[in-house]
């Protein structure tokens, strides 16, 4: 079953390579377990950036080596991606699955274009 997912169209990463955005889904029921996946689309290639499964009201748990962190509040997921560089500029798509209880729902956002600008190196001081 399909579900609507909303996310901002554009986000500019900070000078430290951190980008945050909210992924909001229109839950048709009372889900207790949710899976969130962030995918990056660039040059028609899609790669998985990170994924987390969480129980409603609890922290999102990403893998130890994940570049993502996040918190949830109701039907909103606040996602933060760190360690970004200019080459990571691309469309970051939020995918939400309501895993439990049945029925299963899947929603895919239109994507957030994240722009990353590498900071200029500081000039050497004499």
């Amino acid at each position: 079953k399909a579900m609507h997912v909303a996310q901002p169209a554009v986000v500019l990463a900070s000078s430290r390579g951190i980008a945050s955005f909210v992924c909001e889904y229109a839950s048709p029921g009372k889900a207790t377990e949710v899976r969130v996946t962030v995918l990056r689309q660039a040059d028609s290639q899609v790669t998985e950036v990170c994924a987390a499964t969480y129980m409603m009201g609890n922290e999102l748990t990403f893998l130890d080596d994940s570049i993502c962190t996040g918190t949830s509040s109701g039907n909103q997921v606040n996602l933060t991606i760190q360690g970004l560089r200019a080459m990571d500029t691309g469309l970051y798509i939020c995918k939400v699955e309501l895993m439990y209880p049945p029925p299963y729902y899947l929603g895919i956002g239109n994507g957030t274009q994240i722009y990353v600008i590498d900071p200029e190196p500081c000039p050497d001081s004499d």
């Epitope: 899609v46 998985e48 899947l106 895919i108």
Partner: nanobody, 119 residues
Framework: EVQLVESGGGLVQPGGSLRLSCAAS????????MGWFRQAPGKGQEFVSD????????YYADSVKGRFTISRDNAKNTLYLQMNSLRPEDTAVYYC????????????WGQGTLVTVSS
């Protein structure tokens, strides 16, 4: 056109085991993910398990964790679901599904195979 064909369903006693297979044909097997869903009579579609090829990560519904194991054999273009310690509440039609890119949703579905757990 990709086709998914499930097999391995049948009647089994509580506590018994079954292994479901899902053979993919007609296209590439390099899916982003493949999974198993089930639907019991009069109930909504339930996620059972899936495997994401990029990282080889597996996910399971709490109701089957520790009892079911998902795996795939790329050489045979086949996805498996090993089901142990079966319970009457596992009775359902089990469907195999495949996802091409991760942002397209579950693109392909099998026709389903019936699993009945009863004494």
């Amino acid at each position: 056109e990709v086709q998914l064909v499930e097999s391995g369903g049948g009647l089994v006693q509580p506590g018994g085991s079954l292994r479901l297979s899902c053979a993919a044909s007609g296209g590439t097997f390099s899916f982003y993910g493949m999974g198993w869903f089930r639907q019991a009579p009069g109930k909504g579609q339930e996620f059972v398990s899936d495997i994401r090829t990029s990282a080889g990560r597996t996910y399971y519904a709490d109701s089957v964790k520790g009892r079911f194991t998902i795996s795939r054999d790329n050489a045979k273009n086949t996805l498996y679901l090993q089901m142990n310690s079966l319970r009457p509440e596992d009775t359902a039609v089990y469907y195999c599904a495949a996802e091409m890119s991760g942002i397209s949703g579950w693109d392909y579905w099998g026709q389903g195979t019936l699993v009945t757990v009863s004494s």
